[in-house]
């Protein structure tokens, strides 16, 4: 019996087609993805093949103005239109709190939403009961397939699930649910979830009875053969894991941002054992037509976005200096504003010992593309912020050793004075440079804000200590020459859309007046 699994993950609000790098579509003839194009390909495959499941492995939420404005209603609407069969909860589904998940998505989705390792307690337990499930048995042709969900247990540090949801260890939580499916005579089981490729492989290895793992969170690109675009494969598709009980378990992921549609064909024997598996992600490039009816619906929903981008988010009573003459040479108040917003967006008081789990921010000055003048009645709009942060990036959470941070700050000024983008703006960090010293030895003082303290204060950076830092995904990926970050990071979790982080902060503060306050000094 053959099953076709079509899968997406980490779509992050890319409802419209995008450029090849998943930013805003500029030249339509070269654009990719989007739900209208995805629908065309899904329908084509459904037409051709008998047993097709369309699955999403989480993180539909967060990433573009679509999510900022529609807050998840767009996800439910268009996933319903594409007739998804199931979705796993990702960490970003909790970005607007549990209410922001329940109302727009859980109550509106016409497909099951899954996670076996999230347990509700207290008053939330009855409120959320039945709105998401640990597993679902789906009829597919003449057979049934069990889908069991999972979500990153780091979600409380990455999003806003509140205090009434407990995120358990994935493997511990999955095993009893899979066992239950087996007792129900379900012998074909897919683990669908959002914990990253390393955990996907562990689930394949450790959870008895799981036949296939469809994952997300780590934006992993797998491919067999010559890859069709810029993404470099992390391995073959599917990635085969040998389970502890000797089975060959295919593990798949389909990069991110709706650029690819994962396509996996699985052949099962009559006892539900995987006989063979093959496939590849399908690049959704512009040669695949956008479905006109879905496209028309997108255009209808778009109208509200255009109106939103010119509305006032808040006010500034000072000039927000985002000029390259400032931000690439010295501390600039636009850099301070953005870093403060980045830290504020990551406030998660999850432990009495820590006032927060993260206190530090770094931001490449070259990523700040425009100032905002306060003389326009002080008004700040989404449109203004899009000029400051035009690249559609995210502000991510990483864990780095102090020694890596020291290297990053040396790199920040290794060729100082040439207006290059690697000069770092900061938050929760005090740095002093001596430019008279040779490159690679210019950081003379580097103090960082403590987290394990009731009264935050600045302490010298410890080379062997592991620190959490918020930074643009561009830096996490080694951009602007920060190869040491990419090579040495110990953990990397994708965060929220850059503009969304700053806009939320400005809306919260109502009036802002960031200063230049001695975060970066030259001796």
């Amino acid at each position: 019996w053959e099953l076709t699994i079509l899968h997406t993950n980490d779509v992050h609000s890319r409802l419209e087609q995008t450029s090849e790098d998943s930013s805003k579509c500029v030249n339509a003839s070269r654009c990719m993805g989007g739900v209208a194009r995805l629908f065309t390909k899904v329908q084509q495959i459904r037409r051709a093949e008998p047993n097709v499941l369309l699955l999403d492995a989480g993180d539909q939420y967060q990433g573009t103005i679509w999510f900022t404005v529609y807050k998840g209603a767009e996800v439910a609407h268009f996933m319903n239109a594409l007739r998804y069969d199931a979705m796993a909860l990702g960490n970003h589904e909790f970005d607007n709190g549990v209410e922001g998940l329940i109302e727009p998505l859980l109550k509106e989705a016409k497909f099951p939403i899954l996670s076996a390792n999230i347990k509700a307690k207290g008053p939330l337990a009855s409120q959320i009961s039945g709105l998401y499930l640990p597993y679902k048995v789906l009829p597919v042709g003449d057979e049934v397939v069990g889908i069991v969900g999972y979500t990153s247990k780091e979600t409380p540090f990455l999003s806003n699930p509140g205090t009434n949801l407990v995120f358990e260890d994935e493997i511990t939580a999955l095993q009893p649910e899979v066992d239950k499916l087996k007792t129900l005579n379900v012998n074909k089981i897919i683990a669908l979830g959002h914990s990253g490729f390393e955990m996907d492989k562990l689930i394949a290895q450790k959870v008895r009875g799981v036949d296939v793992v469809v994952g997300g969170h780590s934006n992993t690109f797998l491919y067999t053969g010559n890859p069709p675009s810029k993404e470099v494969p992390a391995g073959k598709y599917p990635f085969i894991v040998t389970s502890d009980d000797g089975r060959k378990v295919p593990v798949v992921q389909a990069y991110a941002f709706g650029k690819y549609l994962g396509y996996l064909k699985i052949e099962f024997d009559e006892r539900g054992n995987v006989i063979s598996s093959h496939g590849n992600p399908i690049l959704l490039n512009s040669s695949i037509p956008e479905d006109p009816s879905i496209k028309a619906d997108i255009n209808k929903w778009r109208i509200k976005l255009d109106n939103y981008s010119t509305q006032e988010l808040g006010k500034t009573i000072v000039y927000l200096d985002g000029s390259s003459q400032s931000c690439r040479f010295r501390e600039c108040n636009m850099g301070n504003l953005i870093c403060d917003a980045m830290i504020n967006n990551n406030l998660r008081h999850t432990d009495e010992m820590f006032w927060n789990h993260v206190s530090m921010c770094i931001l490449n000055g070259g990523g700040i593309r425009s100032p905002i003048d306060e003389r326009n009645n002080g008004t700040i709009t989404w449109e203004n912020l899009a000029a400051v942060l035009p690249f559609g990036g995210t502000f991510d959470l990483v864990q780095l050793k102090g020694s890596t941070l020291k290297k990053a700050f040396e790199h920040s000024v290794h060729r100082y004075g040439q207006s290059t983008g690697e000069f770092l703006q900061v938050g929760g960090i005090h740095v002093v440079y001596d430019l008279s010293r040779k490159p690679g030895d210019r950081v003379v003082k580097l103090d960082v804000l403590c987290t394990k303290c009731r009264v935050p204060s600045y302490d010298p950076l410890k080379m062997d200590e592991v620190y959490k830092v918020i930074l643009p995904n561009f830096l996490a990926n080694g951009g602007d020459g920060f190869q040491m970050i990419k090579d040495e990071l110990l953990r990397h979790d994708s965060g929220d859309q850059d503009i969304n982080v700053v806009s939320t902060y400005i809306s919260k503060m109502k009036v802002i007046y960031p200063a230049v306050e001695g975060r970066i000094k030259f001796s």
Epitope: R47, S287, I288, D291, P292
Partner: antibody
Framework: QVQLVQSGAEVKKPGSSVKVSCKAS????????LSWVRQAPGQGLEWMGE????????YYNEKFKGRVTITADESTSTAYMELSSLRSEDTAVYYC??????????????WGAGTTVTVSS | DIQMTQSPSSLSASVGDRVTITCKAS??????VAWYQQKPGKAPKLLLY???YRYSGVPSRFSGSGSGTDYTLTISSLQPEDFATYYC?????????FGGGTKLEIK
């Protein structure tokens, strides 16, 4: 290399049936669609229907309302098109053509050489 | 059914000429349009797919454009081997339909 080899020319009486074969080689038969297209003498092209050999799913042009049946034999990588209740207007060259539904080429990328069917009393 | 209206039905041109053939669909076919070249006694050959994508091995003098209902095939500089009949086809909805063809003849 990809090849679609069709059966030889046929002469048929009105009211009878014809079954044309198309043997595929050089690719995975079950991973592509196969369409049948005909061309009457001096005329344009007309799509008759398609089959997806992996599933056996078939779709037909309503114009042929029940007269056409498309089948596939996975074991021999061969597709068949049977047209019944033949009339003189069915005199045409019948082509099979491959369709890559998993790729992005929206069109028929490989064609058979064609089979001439003549309907005459 | 979606009608594909191709024009002109015949065209005389010389080697080196720039030639344009148009195809109008009776409804939006969302770039799901292919163009074929057919020579007498031969099967059609795929030239362009998805309105503007050249099929592998097709010379760069062949180009396509269009969206919605209007599509164009352009041959930038006619070569002797280009004299043939050209068909457009919509691959958006079944029944897939072809244009009536454009016979390109030598002037």
């Amino acid at each position: 290399q990809v090849q679609l080899v069709q059966s030889g020319a046929e002469v048929k009486k009105p009211g009878s049936s014809v079954k044309v074969s198309c043997k595929a080689s050089g690719y995975t038969f079950t991973s592509y669609g196969l369409s049948w297209v005909r061309q009457a003498p001096g005329q344009g092209l007309e799509w008759m229907g398609e089959i997806y050999p992996g599933s056996g799913n078939t779709y037909y042009n309503e114009k042929f309302k029940g007269r056409v049946t498309i089948t596939a034999d996975e074991s021999t990588s061969t597709a068949y098109m049977e047209l019944s209740s033949l009339r003189s207007e069915d005199t045409a060259v019948y082509y099979c053509a491959r369709y890559d539904y998993l790729g992005s080429s929206y069109g028929f990328d490989y064609w058979g050489a064609g089979t001439t069917v003549t309907v005459s009393s | 059914d979606i009608q594909m209206t191709q024009s002109p039905s015949s065209l005389s041109a010389s080697v080196g000429d720039r030639v344009t053939i148009t195809c109008k669909a009776s409804q939006d076919v969302s770039t799901a349009v292919a163009w074929y070249q057919q020579k007498p006694g031969k099967a059609p050959k795929l030239l362009l797919y998805s309105a503007s994508y050249r099929y592998s091995g097709v010379p760069s003098r062949f180009s396509g454009s269009g969206s919605g209902t209007d599509y164009t095939l352009t041959i930038s500089s006619l070569q002797p081997e280009d004299f043939a009949t050209y068909y457009c086809q919509q691959h958006y909805n079944t029944p897939y339909t072809f244009g009536g063809g454009t016979k390109l003849e030598i002037k």
